[in-house]
Structures are given as C-alpha cells and as structure tokens.
C-alpha cells in the first residue's frame, strides 16, 4: 500500500512498496511479478477515446 | 567518496545470536534500497536479505527466514542484520551492498566483509 | 527459483589473450543480468550492468552480451589485475536475486 502522505502515483504508475517510489507500469511486461505490478492490473491506463458513439 | 563498512562479525556458537551492522557515508542513504549477501569460506555469493529504503517492506532468503532480521536507521546511516539460532552452516563472510540509482536491479557499492564463524 | 550457471568453471588463460564466460538462466530473465569481479579477500566489483551496459570506471576491455537466458561477459584483451573470479547475477526475480557459482580466471 502507498505510504501514508506521498502523493498518488501519475496514471500508468504503480507505488512499489519495495523500493518506495511509483513505478512505471510499463516495466511489467518485461517483469510482471514485481510488487508494483498488481497496482497496474487494478487500474489499467485509459483506454482508446471512442470515435464513434 | 561511497563507503559501506561491516562491523559486528566474530566467532559464535551454535544457537546463538550475533548483529551485524553496515555504516554508510558518501551519500545520502535513506533513498537505496540495501542487501545483505555472504559467501561461505571458498564458496560463491549468496543473496541473504533485501530492505526497501524506508524499511517497510523486506525479504529473505529461505535459508534463513525466521531467524535473521534486516533493519536500518536512516538517521544513523546505518544497516543491520540481525542473526539468531545461528547454524555451521551460516558461517561466512557478510557484506552489505547498495541498490544502484535507487533500485534493485544492480548493486552498485559493496562493503568489505565481516565474517562470522559459528562453531563449538 | 531461477538458477545460475556459468561455463566453465576454471578457465586458464595469458595476458593479451581474449576471454569469454558464459552465463545462462533457468528461465528467460529478459537482461536482468549483472557481472560482478571478485579479487581473493576482496568485495565483489560491479563490471556491468543490464546485460551490457558498463559500469562507470571500469575499462572498457569489458563488454557484456546476451538476452533472454543466455549472456556473456568478455574481456577483450586480458590484463594482469584481470586474474579474478567473475559472477553473473539475475535480478529478474529482484528483490530475491541469485548469483552464478563463479569463473575463476586463472594464469596459464
């Protein structure tokens, strides 16, 4: 869980408690069972805006 | 200049306790994540413990979950190991190590060693 | 876990020659992989990083390949302060990492 006072982590970022600072959710591809990593799968980035209704 | 120094280390018996500590100078210690790692008398490297920077959150290697215990005091630059119910086989030489530019993917700066020797 | 090795395990060799040292994981690690230089009595070195990536201050007869499971550490042109014992590390599964069991270069 993010430490209590820091800032939320900027969309496509994860807080990582093993190292205390947000992680970019890129990174898990390459290593997807880093700490981090279950924050991304919980808010995926924003999708693609629709172009049709 | 980066230096971490070892210090602690002696000879102990069987079941017994010992703490390692690990000061650091050089740099500003609280942002890197540390390692402890050893190496057994003629052997190779063993990953022993992890801490994050703020100390909240560590890990161990299955060798010696439930007995030793990883800290630090980021006021007093400082990492600590401490052993208990020591086994033979945890004799070694200890040393502390730094995470590259804040993360776990490498480890930059190693200290010299302490070596702990647990014997009757 | 991930597992380590490295070939060979001894490897004699003179100055001015080159000199390659395998390492290979269990599973593909991507280039999470570090080479370390350890001198008897010393503490390891860090060499290079993320597969092959130099670390500042270390010569650059030192270069460093490979991905996925299979990596190499190469010295170019080997020097006398290069006699040592070298070590692969995976931080793949970082925090819990886990070292080679090491080449010893040794004089021929």
């Known amino acids: 869980e993010q430490a209590p006072g820091t800032a939320p982590c900027s969309r496509g970022s994860s807080w990582s408690a093993d190292l205390d600072k947000c992680m970019d959710c890129a990174s898990c591809r390459a290593r997807p069972h880093s700490d981090f990593c279950l924050g991304c799968a919980a808010a995926p980035p924003a999708p693609f805006r629709l172009l049709w209704p | 200049e980066v230096q971490l120094l070892e210090s602690g280390g002696g000879l102990v018996q069987p079941g017994g306790s010992l703490r390692l500590s690990c000061a650091a100078s050089g740099f500003t210690f609280s942002p890197y994540p540390m390692i402890w790692v050893r190496q057994a008398p003629g052997k190779g490297l063993e990953w022993v413990s992890y801490i994050s920077p703020s100390g909240g959150k560590t890990h161990y290697a299955d060798s010696v979950k439930g007995r030793f215990t990883i800290s630090r005091d980021n006021s007093k630059n400082t990492l600590y190991l401490q052993m208990n119910s020591l086994r033979a086989e945890d004799t070694a030489v200890y040393y502390c190590?730094?995470?590259?530019?804040?993360?776990?993917?490498?480890?930059?700066?190693w200290g010299q060693g302490t070596l702990v020797t647990v014997s009757s | 876990d991930i597992q380590m090795t490295q070939s060979p395990a001894t490897l004699s060799a003179s100055v001015g020659d080159r000199v390659t040292i395998t390492c290979r994981a269990s599973?593909?690690?991507?280039?999470?992989l570090n080479w370390y230089q350890q001198k008897p009595g010393k503490a390891p070195k860090l060499l290079i990083y993320?597969?092959?990536s130099l670390q500042s201050g270390v010569p650059s007869r030192f270069s460093g390949s490979g991905s996925g499971t299979d990596f190499t550490l190469t010295i170019s042109s080997l020097q006398p302060e290069d006699f040592a014992t070298y070590y692969c590390?995976?931080?793949?599964?970082?925090?819990?990492?886990?070292f080679g069991p090491g080449t010893k270069v040794e004089i021929k």
């Open positions: 599973q593909s690690i991507s280039s999470y």
């Open positions: 590390q995976q931080s793949y599964s970082s925090p819990g990492i886990t």
């Open positions: 993320a597969a092959s």
């Open positions: 190590a730094r995470g590259g530019d804040g993360y776990f993917d490498y480890f930059d700066y």
